[in-house]
Amino acid sequence: QKVTQAQSSVSMPVRKAVTLNCLYETSWWSYYIFWYKQLPSKEMIFLIRQGSDEQNAKSGRYSVNFKKAAKSVALTISALQLEDSAKYFCALGE
């Protein structure tokens, strides 16, 4: 299994939207992609989960564009706030 986030950093103005890309490789039929936000304290905050056989996930300002065949799960954060400045991680799990 493998997860790749090619964007090392992104800068966007407040109130705009940003899309963070995540590509993965897996031989599992059933799996989940999780998006987390890392606080300055290094604490990881769960944001949203995308199931491999679920509709495109959406939760508040967070939405996922799931391309199952291409194994791509992009996180979009809308109406950006200053507090959104952080490091974001995607993770693959069964």
């Epitope: 590509l23 495109n56 564009n65 199952k68 065949a69 791509s72």
Partner: antibody, heavy 117, light 106 residues
């Protein structure tokens, strides 16, 4: 509104290749995968494969690996499917369909391919 | 690959009748989607996520099921419902479709 316009019917000789096109409009082309589906009276609907126009990443049904090759041109919002070494078994209607997660909400009108000597 | 088996292959009904067609999966799936196809036309997205009606689909259609057994029911069949209905899954690595149920109106 979302529209998928496919190329016209093709009559091709056995052993030859053919390239079908699917031009998308009404949405941001790189945001969605494009899939291809084959339909015949014998085998019904069969998923051939898909391409992510944003990255060019492709995925194929094992059955069609080596038979079909998918490409995308972002500048013209068009996806192409090349079918190689055609036989009578490849005679079918081929559809492009835009993905949305695990769904196929939008379909082209189909392209009839007839393989005959 | 997950195989989807639809039954019956052909269903004949009179206007106003209630009809049910089934879709059985060779392994458990999370969701089933349904398409309606009329001769000479491309498949139309009909029901998604097992039970959600696509835009413009009449309320007389309902979808249900879980695991390996799913169904599409039309409460009161109308002449315009004559078509072939296909189920589809994508819980496995590759999407697969059922063989279809052809609905004929007497």
């Amino acid at each position: 509104q979302v529209q998928l316009q496919q190329s016209g019917a093709e009559l091709v000789r056995p052993g030859a290749s053919v390239t079908l096109s699917c031009k998308a409009s009404g949405y941001r082309f790189p945001d969605y995968e494009m899939h291809w589906v084959k339909q015949t009276p014998v085998h019904g609907l069969e998923w051939i494969g898909a391409i992510d126009p944003e990255t060019g990443r492709t995925a194929y049904n094992q059955k069609f690996r080596g038979k079909a090759k998918l490409t995308a041109d972002k500048s013209s919002s068009t996806v192409y499917m090349e079918l190689r070494s055609l036989t009578s078994e490849d005679s079918a209607v081929y559809y492009c369909t835009r993905g949305y997660g695990i769904q196929f909400p939008y379909w082209g009108q189909g392209t009839l391919v007839t393989v005959s000597a | 690959q997950i195989v989807l088996s639809q039954s019956p292959a052909i269903l004949s009904a009179s206007p106003g009748e209630k009809v049910t067609m089934t879709c059985r999966a060779s392994s458990s799936v999370s969701y089933i989607h349904w398409f309606q196809q009329k001769p000479g036309s491309s498949p139309k997205f009909w029901i998604y996520g097992t039970s959600n009606l696509a835009s413009g689909v009449p309320a007389r259609f309902t979808g249900s099921g879980s695991g390996t057994s799913y169904s599409l029911t039309i409460s009161r069949v109308e002449a315009e419902d004559a078509a072939t209905y296909y189920c589809q899954q994508w819980s496995s690595d590759s999407p697969t479709f059922g063989g279809g149920t052809k609905l004929e109106i007497k």
